[in-house]
Each structure stands twice: as structure tokens, then as C-alpha cells.
Amino acid sequence: APVRSLNCTLRDSQQKSLVMSGPYELKALHLQGQDMEQQVVFSMSFVQGEESNDKIPVALGLKEKNLYLSCVLKDDKPTLQLESVDPKNYPKKKMEKRFVFNKIEINNKLEFESAQFPNWYISTSQAENMPVFLGGTKGGQDITDFTMQFVSS
């Protein structure tokens, strides 16, 4: 079917919001009041991938921008980046694996595991105003749990 998408924002389990930091990076920080308008709105697309009863494959694009979160190797390390795509061809149901994240719901919290690099997750730091990154550990200092807020289109 034409790819199903919804608009949403994400906050980490410490309630930090995600905002743009330069043209190709996201950072996480606490926002209040009118500053909440700075947070990025994602277009979450439900794509084909290794779907299971517990994991749903999604792609995370930035709403009305031709940018998608993707996972690539940089200096031999799995790395999160914002990648520019041709808006005529995206989103699509059969996304390249680097764009696919397994959305995992546990206790009303969401994790986003890279499909390209299993056991690597979209992560934020405890510290304020730091980049959103791909982390290889769960349950440590870094934060891998998020909540999702629906945004009307």
C-alpha cells in the first residue's frame, strides 16, 4: 500500500525534546512554553522490514523536509546521521535498510533500534544540548527510551 505515515514528536525519558542543530544534526534539550515550537516534527513511515510481534519497522523523516535519519558506518562505528533524499522517491514502503529502525514498545516507552546495526539504538546523553546519536548500550548512562506525541497533519 502507499506507505502509511504519521506526524509526531519524540521526547527522551528525561523529557528532553529534539531540535535541529545545524542542517544535518539533531540535539536534545529541555524546552518549555513557546520554545516547544522549535522541536522537530517527524514523519514516521511504516515500512517493510524485519517486523515481529514486538518490533515495527519505521523510517523517521523530518516533516516537510527531504531529510531522513539513517545509520551508516563512519570510521568503523555505526553512526546516526540526517541524510538528504530525493523527495520524489521518498518515503517508500521498501526503504533501504540504513533508513529503517525497529520501533520497540516496552512499558509505554519506545526504543528505536537500527535495522542495519542490531542492538544499536537512537540515543541521547544525560547532558543538555548534546547531539542525538546511535548508541550501542542500553540501560547505561545514555538514554534510549522515548515517548511519542502525535501531531495533527
Epitope: A1, S52, K93, P118
Partner: antibody, heavy 122, light 107 residues
Framework: EVQLQESGPGLVKPSETLSLTCTVS????????VSWIRQPPGKGLEWLGL???????YYNSPLKSRLTISKDNSKSQVSLKLSSVTAADTAVYYC????????????????WGQGTLVTVSS | DIQMTQSPSSLSASVGDRVTITCQTS??????MNWYQQKPGKAPKLLIS???HLRPGVPSRFSGSGSGTDFTFTISSLQPEDFATYYC?????????FGQGTKLEIK
């Protein structure tokens, strides 16, 4: 050459657990998903569930509480266990490899085993 | 779950005939339709994936078309070895669902 072969007991008693093994060759279980499908005698095909290369599983809802699919990559074997069987579970059981085309892993199945008939009867 | 309506359930035809089988889905599945051939006592064989993509080694007399909810499978000129049962399968989303099958018999 891709090959899949199902094996297991041909007769299972009601309320017991049906256990089947699918042994594969010509591809790696860490790279491709494997589905199980069944066909009651003279009837159509029913998809039961699958196990992905990474080990995650998806089970068809009506069977979810009774079905377990697991695998051993090193032995190139996938197993199916269906508990609390009744006569309605009598069928030919097939395992089949997930399709890959143009680098995409599709949900469909391209290569199938020859199937094994399992009869549930006391 | 996506419901599949395959028709006809059975069909009598002669060698050389052109045969068409249709499959309708209860939801839009884009091009994620597959067609299988099954002979008695044998496993199904994948003939067409992604709606119209002929699998390697499958004769060109077999073809598929359609997208969305309406799909067609055609054999342009029936050969003796084509008499079998044909199934459609949607692979858009889980659970995967098959059509009820079309038994193609010799007239």
C-alpha cells in the same frame, strides 16, 4: 542450490505438541527469514508465522498462543512447535525461504520444502 | 487482516487457450502480490512476485498485472504441464494471506 527439507513425526496425538524441523542448505539462516505454511488435505494454504535472520518472530494471531518458531543457525535448522493440537491441525506442513529481489527482503516465500504430512489422531 | 478473493475457484480449459485468474484484496497492497503454482503432492512454486515480476526460469507465457486491490494472472497459451492449482498471496503486511486457489483442469 537452495533446498529446504521438513522432518518430524507423521502422527501426533490430540492435546500433544507437534514438533517439526526444517533443515536448509544453499543459504544462511542468519541472512534470510524462514516461514512455516500448512495445507489441510484438499484445502488451501495458511501462513503460520516466520523467523527472521536476526531471530525475531512473527506469529499469525489465531495460533500465537500455541506456536513457537526457533532456529539454530549453526545447524541450519528451523523448528516449529505447535502445542495442544486437535484434528483441525492435520495438514501438510511446509517451511519456505523468504524472497530477496533487487537487494530487498520481501515478505513472500521463494523456495519451499517438499512438505511433511502430520496427522493428529489418537 | 487482509482478505483475499480469488476467482474463479475452478476453470476448465484446453491446451493453447488463454487463461486469466483474478485476485482482489480488501485493502490497497501496492504491488505486493505473488502468484504460485501447485501440482498434486508437490510444494507451491513461486511464479510471479511484486505483481508482475517473472521469477527466474519461469516461462514467459505466465504474466501478472495490477496494483492496489485488483490483480490478474494470465497464461497466454496453456501447455499440458500448466494444469495445476494456482494461488495468489499478498505480501504487503502481516499476517500473509493466500487466495482460496484456482484449480485449472483439462477440458
Amino acid at each position: 542450490e537452495v533446498q529446504l527439507q521438513e522432518s518430524g513425526p507423521g502422527l501426533v496425538k490430540p492435546s500433544e505438541t507437534l514438533s517439526l524441523t526444517c533443515t536448509v542448505s544453499g543459504f544462511s539462516l542468519s541472512d534470510f527469514g524462514v516461514s512455516w505454511i500448512r495445507q489441510p488435505p484438499g484445502k488451501g494454504l495458511e501462513w503460520l508465522g516466520l523467523i527472521w535472520g536476526g531471530g525475531d518472530t512473527y506469529y499469525n494471531s489465531p495460533l500465537k498462543s500455541r506456536l513457537t518458531i526457533s532456529k539454530d543457525n549453526s545447524k541450519s535448522q528451523v523448528s516449529l512447535k505447535l502445542s495442544s493440537v486437535t484434528a483441525a491441525d492435520t495438514a501438510v506442513y511446509y517451511c519456505a525461504k523468504q524472497t530477496n529481489i533487487w537487494g530487498y527482503d520481501l515478505y513472500s516465500m521463494d523456495y519451499w520444502g517438499q512438505g511433511t504430512l502430520v496427522t493428529v489422531s489418537s | 487482516d487482509i482478505q483475499m478473493t480469488q476467482s474463479p475457484s475452478s476453470l476448465s480449459a484446453s491446451v493453447g487457450d488463454r487463461v486469466t485468474i483474478t485476485c482482489q484484496t480488501s485493502q490497497d497492497i501496492d504491488d505486493d502480490m505473488n502468484w504460485y503454482q501447485q501440482k498434486p503432492g508437490k510444494a507451491p512454486k513461486l511464479l510471479i512476485s511484486l505483481g508482475s515480476h517473472l521469477r527466474p526460469g519461469v516461462p514467459s507465457r505466465f504474466s501478472g498485472s495490477g496494483s492496489g486491490t485488483d490483480f490478474t494472472f494470465t497464461i497466454s497459451s496453456l501447455q499440458p504441464e500448466d494444469f495445476a492449482t494456482y494461488y495468489c498471496l499478498q505480501s504487503d503486511r502481516f499476517p500473509l494471506t493466500f487466495g482460496q486457489g484456482t484449480k485449472l483442469e483439462i477440458k
